[in-house]
């Protein structure tokens, strides 16, 4: 999947299986990623597990779990708030669009989480205060988390180079560059560009991610995934000057 | 292995509450040098772990991207404290503790928010 970190780094990761997105004293988020096509290096998120830890007079421990084709509007115990404590309403789930869009507000830690199902796969977005991000007591045993440090280099796909290589070529010519089995031949680069431009007129990294996803999968739903990811940034990012991220000139090989 | 502490301190120094070190300022390079120093210190106990190698490569990448020299000043991280998680000994009847912004305003300016997102393939 594509990852935008807390430090506004933008990466495309081929991480497979369960990886922690966030792991601090208040919250644990784990994403499970699966290959989009058999044998593909590119992966997308098929499951999200969010654990809100027990917090003072506010909330009991609550677990939210979303999977492909199952985006519940409740925690796994069936509740929609933080339990029986005095401040239980400081944790709330709201269903925005049935089966497609859920928002979780954790006011006690100033955090908003948006989970969507777009096509077969899930998207995740979070707005969180810096000090909550940094609230890690035991650096030894609390895990590595992608939202803070990004994906390991050996788990990154240089999709910007892929995008450059792809210009002016049809899907057949992409076979060598593609990290996945080639997309259907009926899906040339020009079509991918047109579909992405429609939804993402600014040629930023979200637009490039969209083109990459269409060329590697042939699945138009990924256009919406990039579109909604950018919409979530607009809603959640505190720095309105950093909504769009652009390709940086790279001194190192990808 | 304390490499995650290095990561967090770098993040804190470059995303601080008032004027964060923007990407192309001397402050950013100073924060990077601090990050590099921190990782060097942890090398003995972290050298076999993924987080250490990710940090080392990430620093090299960022140093190169931002034309930072290896020598020069370093920066100190900014840190604040949040109430302890879990069942605290100091229980409060006030619901204010369950509203982050209200309780935050008591000891600081507006909280500095940050964003993370995961989507597509």
């Amino acid at each position: 999947p594509h990852l935008r970190t807390f430090t506004d780094r933008f990466q495309t990761c081929k991480v497979q299986g369960a990886w922690p997105l966030i792991d601090n004293n208040y919250l644990n988020v784990q994403a499970t990623n699966t290959p989009v096509l058999p044998g593909s290096a590119a992966t997308a998120t098929s499951k999200l597990t969010i654990i809100f830890k027990n917090f003072q007079e506010c909330v009991d421990q609550k677990v939210y779990q979303a999977e492909m084709d199952e985006l519940p509007a409740a925690f796994v115990d069936g509740s929609k708030n933080g339990g029986d404590k005095h401040g239980a309403n400081s944790l709330k789930i709201t269903e925005k669009v049935s089966g497609q869009h859920v928002e979780i507000q954790a006011k006690y830690i100033g955090t908003t989480i948006v989970v969507r199902q777009v096509g077969r796969y899930l998207t995740f977005a979070v707005r969180m205060p810096e000090e909550v991000v940094n609230a890690v007591e035991d650096w030894d045993s609390q895990g590595l988390y992608l939202c803070l440090r990004g994906c390991p280099l050996n788990q990154q796909i240089d999709f910007q180079a892929f995008h450059t290589n792809a210009e002016g070529t049809g899907a057949r010519r992409l076979a060598a560059a593609s990290p996945a089995p080639t997309a259907p031949e009926t899906f040339p680069y020009e079509t991918a560009v047109a579909k992405c431009k429609e939804k993402l007129p600014v040629e930023d990294l979200y637009y490039q991610a969209c083109v990459f996803d269409l060329l590697t999968t042939g699945d138009v739903n990924f256009t919406l995934a990039a579109y909604y990811a950018l919409e979530d940034v607009k809603m959640l990012h505190s720095n309105k000057d950093k909504l769009h991220l652009y390709e940086r000139t790279r001194d190192l090989p990808g | 292995c304390k490499i995650l502490k290095c990561n967090s301190e770098f993040w804190s120094a470059t995303s601080g509450s008032h004027a964060p070190a923007s990407d192309d300022t001397p402050e950013f390079c100073a924060a990077l040098r601090s990050y590099a120093l921190c990782t060097r210190r942890t090398a003995r106990t972290c050298r076999g772990d993924l987080a250490y190698h990710s940090a080392v490569h990430g620093i090299e990448d960022l140093m190169s991207q931002h034309n930072c020299s290896k020598d020069g000043p370093t920066s100190q991280p900014r840190l604040r404290t949040l109430p302890p998680a879990g069942d605290s000994q100091e229980r409060s009847d006030s619901p204010e503790i369950c509203h982050y912004e209200k309780s935050f305003h008591k000891h600081s300016a507006t909280p500095n928010y940050t964003h993370c997102g995961l989507f597509g393939d």
Epitope: - | T45, Y52, H53
Partner: antibody, heavy 115, light 112 residues
Framework: EVQLVESGGGLVQPGGSLRLSCAAS????????MNWIRQAPGKGLEWIGM????????HYADSVKGRFTISRDNSKNTLYLQMNSLRAEDTAVYYC????????WGQGTMVTVSS | DVVLTQSPLSLPVTLGQPASISCRSS???????????LEWFQQRPGQSPRRLIY???NRFSGVPDRFSGSGSGTDFTLKISRVEAEDVGVYYC?????????FGQGTKLEIK
């Protein structure tokens, strides 16, 4: 909860070989360096060696260099210790431990080298 | 190789009393800018070792605060402020500053 379970120990003749396994759970195995440490009966602890998270580097104690090989299979969350040319002095409980420096240890598996 | 020498090798203590174990290194364990990778492990009878202290004085997660570590350079100490029955076992110092990693020979703590 971090769990490490060693297996593969037993009785072997001098000069023989044995492969120990360490099954890991409760943490992201592929993120961490791993160690093997042993303890002869009634004796202290001896570090055998360690392997990086991606197997890119391995370090060994002089006493086992050239005879023992550490490997790992991250897809199976398993660490291995291949022991060749075994000697009587290799008789010990063998522990695997998580981290570049060992923080969590398994319960150990006994290796007896005797004719 | 770095040799770690512990003393005493046997330490009989009365319950509730303090205990102190010394670990002396054959060379300085300071690695860089004050970082010293000296650790302490506890091995209860019939169990595997458990990490107590790392970097001379930092308690590992779940370790009671009656355990404390101190020292620098080549001389290090593990202190137990009030010994409890569950503290019986062998205590090892361990260094990760130099390759190969080495352990002390162990100090057996028993109740008087």
């Amino acid at each position: 909860e971090v769990q490490l379970v060693e297996s593969g120990g037993g009785l072997v003749q001098p000069g023989g070989s044995l492969r120990l396994s360490c099954a890991a759970s409760g943490f992201t195995f592929s993120n961490y360096g791993m160690n093997w440490i042993r303890q002869a009966p009634g004796k202290g602890l001896e570090w055998i060696g360690m392997i990086y998270y991606d197997s890119s580097e391995k370090h060994y104690a002089d006493s086992v260099k050239g005879r023992f090989t550490i490997s790992r299979d991250n897809s199976k969350n398993t660490l291995y210790l291949q022991m060749n040319s075994l000697r009587a002095e290799d008789t010990a409980v063998y522990y695997c431990a998580k981290g570049t420096t060992p923080d969590y240890w398994g319960q150990g598996t006994m290796v007896t080298v005797s004719s | 190789d770095v040799v770690l020498t512990q003393s005493p090798l046997s330490l009989p203590v009365t319950l509730g009393q303090p205990a102190s174990i010394s670990c002396r290194s054959s060379q300085s364990l300071e690695y860089s800018d004050g970082y010293t990778f000296l650790e302490w492990f506890q091995q209860r009878p019939g169990q595997s070792p458990r990490r107590l202290i790392y970097e001379v004085s930092n308690r590992f997660s779940g370790v009671p605060d009656r355990f404390s570590g101190s020292g620098s350079g080549t001389d290090f100490t593990l202190k137990i402020s009030r010994v409890e029955a569950e503290d019986v076992g062998v205590y090892y110092c361990f260094q990760a500053t130099h390759d190969p990693l080495t352990f002390g020979q162990g100090t057996k703590l028993e109740i008087k």
